[in-house]
Amino acid sequence: GILNLNKMVKQVTGKMPILSYWPYGCHCGLGGRGQPKDATDWCCQTHDCCYDHLKTQGCSIYKDYYRYNFSQGNIHCSDKGSWCEQQLCACDKEVAFCLKRNLDTYQKRLRFYWRPHCRGQTPGC
């Protein structure tokens, strides 16, 4: 769920998601449209696709709570939960490390980006 994602992103990137990523660009945060603005925004667009796939599979992406361990900079998703819980953790782990990989190109000007400026084709999943 959202609490899992926030905690994981903070642990992996060292940034407070609510201040740094939700929202950011055209796809980080709720919703998303248009062409992603940069690599960080692409992380979020890919994550949206991951969530969309789980939604089609009947998973409650915002409610399902999963367990994971964070140790020595790595995330280990618990294999104890339901199928949805395990897949949700995998989606969140991927976006957390994607955001970390792209910290060097993070642009403060894209924080709280005005969504009506998000134009162009929204990438398919």
Epitope: T56, Q57, G58, D64, D79, K80, W83, C84
Partner: antibody, heavy 120, light 106 residues
Framework: QVTLKESGPGILQSSQTLSLTCSFS??????????VSWIRQPSGKGLEWLAH???????RYNPSLKSRLTISKDTSRNQVFLKITSVDTADSATYYC????????????WGQGTTLTVSS | QIVLTQSPAIMSASPGEKVTISCSAS?????MYWYQQKPGSSPKRWIY???KLASGVPARFSGSGSGTSYSLTISSMEAEDAATYYC?????????FGSGTKLEIK
């Protein structure tokens, strides 16, 4: 060869506490990924999952019964226990323990079951 | 929680007849699992990951489905197949079972 065997009191009065034991062999609950569930089946009816305990002592309960259930284990004796408080006639059923490995989403080995009758 | 509805509740089939048992989920699931239970015995894992047969299960059994609709099929009914069959999901917590389909031999 994996085997599980349940034992219990057979008969209880309403409001008493049910204590069940599952004794197993052929696997160890100290092995990562291993777990044991309790599942019950009222006579002539379907199956209801109750609780699960993992190798690392993590536990899961059926939300509809959570307040009445306690699952525990004795790894060295290869046993898993289930307690159900304040039993009622609706708890009359055959109780099974079953093994589930975390990487699978089904129960691969089941015990023979132990029958509980609750009298009012 | 996900509710699994099996149909029919009871059915009878003649030897050699094709049998299909259905399991409908209240919301989409990724995989379905099936168990066979005979009177006085515990359930046995029968079909896993929707379509894979457990060890020792005859090849006349098959499983299929996706989303909310799954089924177990026996291509040619035999007397030893008379039993109750249960579907089960652990797509989302908690794991749940269907109400069962009792299959009798004519």
């Amino acid at each position: 060869q994996v085997t599980l065997k349940e034992s219990g009191p057979g008969i209880l009065q309403s409001s008493q506490t049910l204590s069940l034991t599952c004794s197993f062999s052929g696997f160890s609950l100290s092995t990562s990924g291993m777990g044991v569930s309790w599942i019950r089946q009222p006579s002539g009816k379907g199956l209801e999952w109750l609780a699960h305990i993992y190798w690392d002592d993590d536990k899961r309960y059926n939300p509809s019964l959570k307040s009445r259930l306690t699952i525990s284990k004795d790894t060295s004796r290869n046993q898993v226990f289930l307690k159900i408080t304040s039993v009622d006639t609706a708890d009359s059923a055959t109780y099974y323990c079953a093994r589930r490995e975390s990487k699978y989403f089904y129960f691969d080995y089941w015990g023979q079951g132990t029958t509980l009758t609750v009298s009012s | 929680q996900i509710v699994l509805t099996q149909s029919p509740a009871i059915m009878s089939a003649s030897p050699g007849e094709k049998v299909t048992i259905s399991c409908s989920a209240s919301s989409s699931v990724s995989y379905m699992y099936w168990y066979q239970q005979k009177p006085g015995s515990s359930p046995k894992r029968w079909i896993y990951d929707t379509s894979k047969l457990a060890s020792g299960v005859p090849a006349r059994f098959s499983g299929s489905g996706s989303g909310t609709s799954y089924s177990l099929t026996i291509s040619s009914m035999e007397a030893e197949d008379a039993a109750t069959y249960y579907c089960q999901q652990y797509h989302s917590y908690p794991p749940t079972f269907g109400s069962g389909t009792k299959l009798e031999i004519k």
